[in-house]
Structures are given as structure tokens and as C-alpha cells.
């Protein structure tokens, strides 16, 4: 039975040209994390392995950087950075958890760097 | 140089039993999960079945599942596949890989060839 | 299970001809798609991981596209070497899948 419940920072919005972190949080849980894939809409953007530690995908390695912990962090911001982001737990014994977090990127005099919207 | 290296196929009557192996070499062996992938001749690639990094998860496609079991030796950097209740259609080569973070097969064994027949 | 529908089957091309083959997805496989390159007698050996990655050592004249349902594996300019059947296979869920093959044959 899957009792763990993913912690995300939900909805964020950012500055263009700057950069935000995106994490996620696995709890209630005794389960094992093996791996955590983070995904860009339809697209792989990173991985972290247990075993193997970080895979960034080619496509992303110059404005993608693994961490703070299993987070990840985006640099360079653009517009078209807008959209959902899901952080993918691949866990042992439970099974797959996944959290899912907005990003809207804004242009600088828009924005608050960071803040948080609230979630409906 | 990362290598895979199978072994233990060969021709076996249908209902018998064979065992391959996998030698791995190269590479940290324990930190990767492993696939065993087949096929008939003249045919595609078909999964068989895989393993995590610790051997503590498996996963086994429909067509094999009840009669195979893959297992692994870290300490022997080893893979194993024990097949069972052998039918025709499982005549195929039987290729093991390595499978980083669980989503490419980056590298691939020659292959062992089975032949189940009477 | 996630079907993997590939064409076409086979084709016949030329040396420098652009080739692109085609695999789609019976449902959405986010980038979690993969290309192999098998010669007679030999091993698959990977092209392309997670849609668009091309693997180390793999010529750039391979490159791949696509996310959610429909790929693509292009050659921009055939060479002889590459004359070979080419393989799509998702790892988005057990069990993995592949597609049926494309031989690119010489015209």
C-alpha cells in the first residue's frame, strides 16, 4: 500500500533571464527512493540514481543543474520555460510517487523572483 | 571497456530446462539494472524480463512469466536467467544489457541462441 | 501494454539520401523512447535515448525528434555502414516495448 505523499513547491513564478529550483519532497513513507526523474511536460530533463547520481539530458545541460539535493535548479529563464514540471519518485518497495509543479516565467519588471501563487 | 559476455544456451528438448549467464565486465556492475531481451529467428526484439541494481525488483513480459526467473550475483558480476517449461517459441537468441537509470540499453551482450526442439 | 507501431517496414534508399523513420506510441511515452541499430549476426546497438539524445561515439548525421506518441530517427546523409534495421522502444512502463524494425536496404 502507497501511504507517502509528495511535498511540492507548487506553484512558483520567476524572473526571465533568472533562475529557479525546483524540489520536491517525498514523506510518510518508509519506501526507499531509488531514482527521481524530473520532466518538462513531455520531455526528460534530468535524472538522479541511487547508484548512478545525476543525468542531465544533453538538450538541457547548459540552463539545467542538478540540486540542491534532489532538486533541480533552471538557469537562464525564458518564456517559454512556462509550464508544469513533475517530479517523478521511483521508490522500493511502494512503487512510483509523482509531484507536479507550475512554473510561469515572467518578464523582470513583472515578477517577484520566486513568489509563490497560491494553489486553488 | 564494458563488456557482457552470455553463455549457457544451446538446444534442449520442450518442457526442459537451461540456465544463461551474463558476465559483466568493465563497469560497476552492482550499480546498474539489467535486461534480458531475445530474438526469434528472423524476427524483432522482444523484452524478457529485468532486475534492479540490488536484485531486489524484477519485472518479466507475460509471454515468460511463471516459467523464467532472472536473478543476479553482484559479487560474480553476473546476471542469470533460469528458464523453464522451454517451448518452441521461445527458440531465440537471448541477449542481456545494461540498462542506466532504468530507460536506455546502452550496452548490449553478442548473444547465447536457444533451440527448443525434439 | 504500450504498442509501438513503426514505418515503414522496410525502404530502399541511396547513399547521401535523408532517410527518417517514423515509430508511434499507443499512448503518450512522454520522451521515454529509444533507438537501436542492428546488423545481420550482430547485436543492437543505441542510437538515440530519451527521443533525442544521441549516445557517445554515434555520428551526428543521426538525430532524433518527437514526444508524447510520435518519434522520428533521421539520417541526414545515408552512408554505406548504415545500411541496417533500425528499432524504437519505449521505457516509459513494463513491459518495455519495441517496434517492429525498419530495414534500410540499398537501392
Known amino acids: 500500500m502507497m501511504t507517502g505523499t509528495i511535498e511540492t513547491t507548487g506553484n512558483i513564478s520567476a524572473e526571465k533571464g533568472g533562475s529557479i529550483i525546483l524540489q520536491c519532497h517525498l514523506s510518510s513513507t518508509t519506501a526507499q527512493v531509488t531514482q527521481v526523474n524530473w520532466e518538462q511536460q513531455d520531455q526528460l530533463l534530468a535524472i538522479c540514481n541511487a547508484d548512478l547520481g545525476w543525468h542531465i539530458s544533453p538538450s538541457f545541460k547548459d540552463r539545467v543543474a542538478p540540486g540542491p539535493g534532489l532538486g533541480l535548479t533552471l538557469q537562464s529563464l525564458t518564456v517559454n520555460d512556462t509550464g508544469e514540471y513533475f517530479c517523478i519518485y521511483h521508490t522500493y518497495p511502494d512503487g512510483t510517487y509523482t509531484g507536479r509543479i507550475f512554473l510561469e516565467v515572467l518578464e523582470s519588471s513583472v515578477a517577484e523572483h520566486g513568489a509563490r501563487f497560491q494553489i486553488p | 571497456e564494458v563488456q557482457l559476455l552470455e553463455s549457457g544456451g544451446g538446444l534442449v528438448q520442450p518442457g526442459g530446462s537451461l540456465r544463461l549467464s551474463c558476465a559483466a565486465s568493465g563497469f560497476t556492475f552492482s550499480s546498474y539494472s539489467m535486461h534480458w531481451v531475445r530474438q526469434a529467428p528472423g524476427k524483432g526484439l522482444e523484452w524478457v524480463a529485468n532486475?534492479?541494481?540490488?536484485?531486489?525488483?524484477?519485472g518479466y513480459a507475460d509471454s515468460v512469466k511463471g516459467r523464467f526467473t532472472i536473478s543476479r550475483d553482484n559479487s560474480k558480476n553476473t546476471l542469470y536467467l533460469q528458464m523453464n517449461s522451454l517451448r518452441a517459441e521461445d527458440t531465440a537468441v537471448y541477449y542481456c544489457?545494461?540498462?542506466?537509470?532504468?530507460?536506455?540499453?546502452?550496452?548490449w551482450g553478442q548473444g547465447t541462441l536457444v533451440t527448443v526442439s525434439s | 501494454d504500450i504498442q509501438m507501431t513503426q514505418s515503414p517496414s522496410s525502404l530502399s534508399a541511396s547513399v547521401g539520401d535523408r532517410v527518417t523513420i517514423t515509430c508511434r506510441a499507443s499512448?503518450?511515452?512522454?520522451?521515454?523512447l529509444n533507438w537501436y541499430q542492428q546488423k545481420p549476426g550482430k547485436a543492437p546497438k543505441l542510437l538515440i535515448y530519451?527521443?533525442?539524445s544521441l549516445q557517445s561515439g554515434v555520428p551526428s548525421r543521426f538525430s532524433g525528434s518527437g514526444s508524447g506518441t510520435d518519434f522520428t530517427l533521421t539520417i541526414s546523409s545515408l552512408q554505406p555502414e548504415d545500411f541496417a534495421t533500425y528499432y524504437c522502444?519505449?521505457?516509459?512502463?513494463?513491459?518495455?516495448?519495441f517496434g517492429g524494425g525498419t530495414k534500410v536496404e540499398i537501392k
Open positions: 499512448q503518450s511515452i512522454s520522451s521515454y
Open positions: 530519451a527521443a533525442s
Open positions: 532486475i534492479n541494481s540490488n536484485g531486489g525488483n524484477t
Open positions: 544489457a545494461r540498462v542506466p537509470y532504468d530507460v536506455w540499453m546502452d550496452y
Open positions: 522502444q519505449q521505457s516509459y512502463s513494463t513491459p518495455l516495448t
